[in-house]
Interface confidence: low
């Protein structure tokens, strides 16, 4: 009784059901409405992408399918694609007339044409696949399990995004936000229609709010004739080069090799390639703790059913505010204040004596010469934990960004200043903050030793 898992082009649970022949209101009025919508609303500035959905549906159905055509599978597939597209843009379309008109129109057409909600779609950017049960059916097309090939077939290039988690822990989201978080316990990093990543973070020192990743679970969901459901689990001192069932690929299906684990460095560095969703994951053990990095197409990132619950998924939305450690608030207080004076003024104990500020800076500079947020994270972690391995964690996290991030101009992130409105208004680049401000928040994190 394995619960069903949604697959790539299958419509989600949210939404409507096909109601059978003749069950709905006449949908003929929808077509003029669609034409009107396509022509009437300026598309350039709105974050709501409903016009794109309308256009794709229009092009998928124009010519071969008249509005009153028979209940063809192709037409239903186009409708399902249209529905999928509207769900993806739902979050940015609330209150949008074109969006709501489209949604109601789809419901009418689905009903009138006896289309079931599950089944193949004709989404040009996604593989047109059979419905997603646990079908073992072999595919004639080797491209089904190769995301990039499928994209290029439609003369499109996927937009890739990156997310990483390392150190104390520091999170770089799919939108290139950089946060330092508490997030003790189990937290979902990614949860979309194709995979789920959960991390468990534990305190680095007794009584400390600073945590690091001690366990990582990745679930690759059953997908068409490509892969069986596979679970990968890593823990401190155990970085396996196989899924929990002992296999190193996607199972027994036709496209099983579209999911593959490669051990780069025994017990220290594993890479998982999920070609069927264009995704690469890097898991490392650095010192006692784990780091995670992923490269994933935007389309896969956004393939979620319930946008309202997306605040839970760290890679997409970042850490909840109450879990964030705000560097910037402390930067302002820290301007011109020496690290020693800051530490002395604090009732909390300083970091271990073996790690003075100068040493932390020197060790981080050695590995991370650019004073970006990775460098700041490194210094923060060394002063918080006294564990030199966090230097390597930051270093490898940046190395993984270099390998996985599609925009080479965004490798280094700098903290934006908040007190230079004139500079920002003039369109000038925002200056990186000096490192010093990173010292203050760690004082609150240091354990209290009695």
């Amino acid at each position: 009784m394995q619960p069903p898992r949604e697959r790539l082009v299958v419509t989600g649970r949210a939404g409507w059901m096909g109601m059978g022949r003749g069950a709905g209101r006449s949908a003929l009025g929808f077509w003029p409405t669609l034409a009107f919508l396509l022509c009437s609303f300026p598309a350039a500035t709105s974050p709501c992408k409903i016009l794109k959905c309308n256009s794709e549906f229009w092009s998928a159905t124009s010519g071969s399918h008249a509005p009153a055509s028979d209940d063809t599978p192709e037409f239903c597939a186009a409708l399902r694609s249209y529905a999928l597209c509207t769900r993806r843009t739902a979050r940015t379309c609330r209150g949008d007339l074109a969006y709501h008109s489209a949604v109601h129109g789809i419901e009418d057409l689905m009903s009138q044409h006896n289309c079931s909600k599950d089944g193949p779609t004709s989404q040009p950017r996604l593989r047109t696949l059979p419905p997603a049960g646990d079908s073992q059916e072999r595919s004639d097309s080797p491209e089904i399990c190769h995301y990039e090939k499928s994209f290029h077939k439609h003369s499109a290039t996927p937009n890739y995004t990156h997310c990483g988690l390392f150190g104390d822990p520091h999170l770089r989201t799919f939108t290139d936000r950089f946060q330092t978080c508490k997030v003790q316990g189990a937290w979902p990093l990614i949860d979309n229609n194709y995979l789920n990543v959960q991390v468990t973070n534990t305190p680095v020192l007794p009584g400390s709010a600073a945590t690091a990743t001690s366990k990582l679970t990745i679930i690759f969901k059953n997908f068409q004739e490509c892969v069986d459901q596979k679970v990968y689990q890593a823990e401190m001192d155990e970085l396996p080069a196989a899924f929990v069932d002992g296999s190193k690929n996607g199972g027994d299906k036709h496209g099983a090799n579209s999911l593959k684990i490669t051990e780069k460095v025994s017990g220290q560095h594993v890479e998982i390639q999920a070609k069927y969703i264009g995704t690469t994951i890097v898991v490392r053990q650095v010192g006692r703790y784990l780091t995670f990095a992923v490269r994933m197409p935007e389309e896969v990132v956004n393939a979620v059913e319930d946008w309202d619950s997306q605040g839970l998924y760290l890679c997409l939305r970042g850490c909840p505010l109450n879990q964030q450690i705000d560097f910037q608030a402390f930067h302002t207080n820290a301007e011109g204040t020496g690290a020693r004076r800051l530490a002395a003024a604090s009732p909390a104990p300083t970091a271990p004596e073996t790690f003075p500020y100068e040493t932390a800076v020197a060790k981080c500079k050695e590995k991370l010469p650019v004073e970006d947020l990775y460098y700041q994270a490194c210094v923060f972690d060394l002063l918080t934990t006294g564990d030199v391995n966090f230097t390597l964690a930051a270093y490898y996290a940046l190395e993984d960004v270099k390998m996985l991030h599609s925009n080479k101009d965004k490798l280094h992130l700098y903290e934006r200043t908040r007190d230079l409105p004139g500079r920002a208004a003039a369109g000038l680049p925002l200056a990186p903050r000096p490192l010093l401000g990173a010292l203050v928040p760690l004082l609150a994190l240091l354990p209290v030793f009695c």
């Epitope: 009784m1 394995q2 619960p3 649970r13 003790q184 316990g185 189990a186 937290w187 979902p188 949860d191 789920n196 959960q198 468990t200 679970t217 679930i219 459901q229 679970v231 689990q233 823990e235 155990e238 396996p240 929990v244 069932d245 002992g246 319930d306 619950s309 839970l312 998924y313 909840p320 109450n322």
Partner: antibody, heavy 120, light 109 residues
Framework: EVQLVQSGAEVKKPGASVKVSCKAS????????ISWVRQAPGQGLDWMGW????????NYAQKLQGRVTMTTDTSTSTAYMELSSLRSEDTAVYYC?????????????WGQGTLVTVSS | QSALTQPRSVSGSPGQSVTISCTGT?????????VSWYQQHPGKAPKLMLY???KRPSGVPDRFSGSKSGNTASLTISGLQAEDEADYYC?????????FGGGTKVTVL
């Protein structure tokens, strides 16, 4: 058909140990974790811990640390739960359950339960 | 005392809807996507009804649905039927332990 079949009822004296078995069939044993859950008479469900048959990794409920041991035998697709230093409050029906996916997910298939009675 | 709080009992007539709440902390429910619900008939093993807050395993009727708001997860049974009379338990993974609620007895009047 996916099934978990548990060993029969046990009667133990306080201070003794009990070992309950759970034989899995109908699926790849190493692909899913096994959780153990107990239920005292007239009470609710109480999670005891989890084991990965593939790696042997375990995670025990904090209140049972030191008293519970979970093991598996992949050659026979059997999971075991041993509870030591038994007390009368350990009298309960003990269930094994297959974990749907990952270590902390839903339990989608359950054994029929094993009644353990601790009485002097 | 369970870390997840459920009402001891709820009741409804056939065809009505009943909702069972499951209240915890931000870490046990609020920030968790791993809330599941189990049905248990007297003398029987529990049965999975919902997982990941809202998802329904195959074979579970669609009158069972789940939701979450803040630190409270809910199971709703719409169109109550006689066979729905049972105990229902919520469950959540919270950091290191998996927690069960105390259980709710659903009575069909």
């Amino acid at each position: 058909e996916v099934q978990l079949v548990q060993s029969g009822a046990e009667v133990k004296k306080p201070g003794a140990s009990v070992k309950v078995s759970c034989k899995a069939s109908g699926y790849t044993f190493t692909s899913h974790g096994i959780s153990w859950v107990r239920q005292a008479p007239g009470q609710g469900l109480d999670w005891m811990g989890w084991i990965s048959p593939y790696s042997g990794n375990t995670n025990y409920a904090q209140k049972l640390q030191g008293r519970v041991t979970m093991t598996t035998d992949t050659s026979t697709s059997t999971a075991y739960m041993e509870l030591s230093s038994l007390r009368s409050e350990d009298t309960a029906v003990y269930y094994c359950a297959r974990v749907g996916s990952g270590p902390y997910y839903y339990m989608d298939v359950w054994g029929q339960g094993t009644l353990v009675t601790v009485s002097s | 005392q369970s870390a997840l709080t459920q009402p001891r009992s709820v009741s409804g007539s056939p065809g009505q809807s009943v909702t069972i709440s499951c209240t915890g902390t931000s870490s046990s429910v609020g920030d968790s996507i791993y809330v599941s619900w189990y049905q248990q008939h007297p003398g029987k093993a529990p049965k999975l009804m919902l997982y990941d807050v809202t998802k329904r395993p195959s074979g579970v009727p669609d009158r069972f649905s789940g939701s979450k708001s803040g630190n409270t997860a809910s199971l709703t049974i719409s169109g109550l039927q006689a066979e729905d009379e049972a105990d229902y338990y919520c469950c959540s993974y919270a950091g290191t332990d998996t927690l069960f609620g105390g259980g709710t007895k659903v009575t069909v009047l």
